[in-house]
């Protein structure tokens, strides 16, 4: 998302359709307090940022309340009165949904249903990843709502789970960000565990009849 204008690189993240974070990296102005000016309507005057992000004592970004705002952010990064980067962007291209909340697990024999609170907007995918110490990679399953059933689990194994939310590419484009992962939770025989042993425990011998 960065720009070539005067060597200024920018990054935009639209957190959960609520807050926009614009950060910049401008080597030419590394010891300068650049200012950030913005508007959500092309007809309005620019406002200056009131919530700057600082890096090594100098401005490096701005956090904006953008809840229920129009789709377009018009902004200008300036050195004094001189604009060093000016752009207008559809904010939703840079959507990052919030991390899943109220994650719950419901076990029934060799299957688990993972649920969480659906976000208030649509066109999202809720992804559950899981693995046991026997697995070399995470397995994944995703659904359009936060109600994901995973079948074919081994009740004797310990499984680690975590959940995240992704914006559908067909709707929001390919340059969005997935949410942060929920905390990892570990389960074995339908009960929560502190952790799954890194070394897989050998299977119990079958008792001869």
């Amino acid at each position: 998302q960065g720009g070539a204008a005067e060597g200024v690189q920018i990054q935009i993240i639209y957190f959960n359709l609520e807050t926009v974070q614009v950060t910049w990296n401008a080597s030419k102005y590394s010891r300068t307090n650049l200012t950030f000016h913005y508007r959500f309507n092309g007809d309005e005057a620019y406002d200056q940022c009131t919530n700057y992000l600082l890096q090594e004592g100098h401005t490096s970004g701005c956090l904006l309340d953008a809840e229920q705002r129009d789709d377009i952010l018009y902004f200008s990064i300036r050195n004094g009165t001189h604009p060093v980067f000016t752009a207008s962007r559809w904010m939703v291209y840079y959507l990052k949904p919030s991390s899943p909340k109220h994650v719950r697990f419901s076990w029934h024999q060799d299957a688990v249903t993972v649920t969480c609170s659906d976000l208030s907007y649509g066109d999202l995918l809720y992804e559950v990843q899981y693995r046991s110490p026997f697995d070399t990679e995470w397995q994944s399953k995703q659904e359009n709502t936060c109600n994901v059933t995973i079948e074919g689990l081994d009740a004797e194994k310990c499984y680690s789970f975590w959940v995240r939310v992704k914006a559908m590419e067909d709707v929001y484009g390919p340059d969005t960000y997935p949410s942060d992962w929920s905390e990892v939770t570990c389960w074995q025989r339908g009960e929560i565990r502190d952790a799954c042993a890194e070394t897989p425990t050998p299977p119990k011998p079958k008792l001869s009849k």
Epitope: Q1, G2, G3, A4, A5, Q9, I10, D71, I72, Y74, A87, S88, R89, W90, V92, Y93, D123, D170, V171, Y172, G173, P174, D175
Partner: antibody, heavy 122, light 107 residues
Framework: QIQLQESGPGLVKPSQSLSLTCSVT??????????WTWIRQFPGKKLEWMGY???????YYNPSLKSRISITRDTSKNQFLLHLNSVTTEDTATYYC??????????????WGQGTLVTVSS | DVVLTQTPATLSAIPGERVTMTCKAS??????LHWYQHRPNETPRLLIK???RSITGIPSRFSGSGSGTDFTLGINNLEAEDFAIYYC?????????FGSGTKLEIN
Amino acid sequence: QIQLQESGPGLVKPSQSLSLTCSVTGFSITTSGYYWTWIRQFPGKKLEWMGYIGYNSKTYYNPSLKSRISITRDTSKNQFLLHLNSVTTEDTATYYCARSLYGGYKDAFDSWGQGTLVTVSS
Amino acid sequence: DVVLTQTPATLSAIPGERVTMTCKASQSIGTSLHWYQHRPNETPRLLIKFASRSITGIPSRFSGSGSGTDFTLGINNLEAEDFAIYYCQQSPGFPPTFGSGTKLEIN
């Protein structure tokens, strides 16, 4: 199969208004998630996006035209309309209507009309 | 506005060849860059969306690549119907903008 067809006068006098209609068949313009747009191509082949109207009636206009442009729709006829005021010879172009890809974010244009040439001349 | 610069302005080739053309954006636009083909007296046609994603019904000899500011459209095994003007278009910047076009002509 969606089809778009532009219609309107081929000749407009300077300072007058230009009005064009895009008739859509095979697809409803109120289908959620789709935006409907006007794009023009100048005689030198340069393309310019003019504006959108959404499934929800929301409009967006090119800032370079904002004071002169209006896009409306007539859902009963499944049409959307372009109005451009105070035209000059610089507005001579082929005008296309188009549909944007599904998705809020107006992305690319996957269905276009054949285009209609509008000449501004006295 | 995001300015898109297409090169070359004109490209001469013969059927059966492979050609590439480029589109350079004045600001980084991720992968939200789309390609169109416009043949004379026809309606423009979307070829590639989001830099490299294929479109249903478009022959597989058309391919796209790139991200950030530099993008490429490639056409393998040129056919007579491919001689046309090709435009790139960006969508994250407002307003959406098009490149000035590359005219692919028969040598």
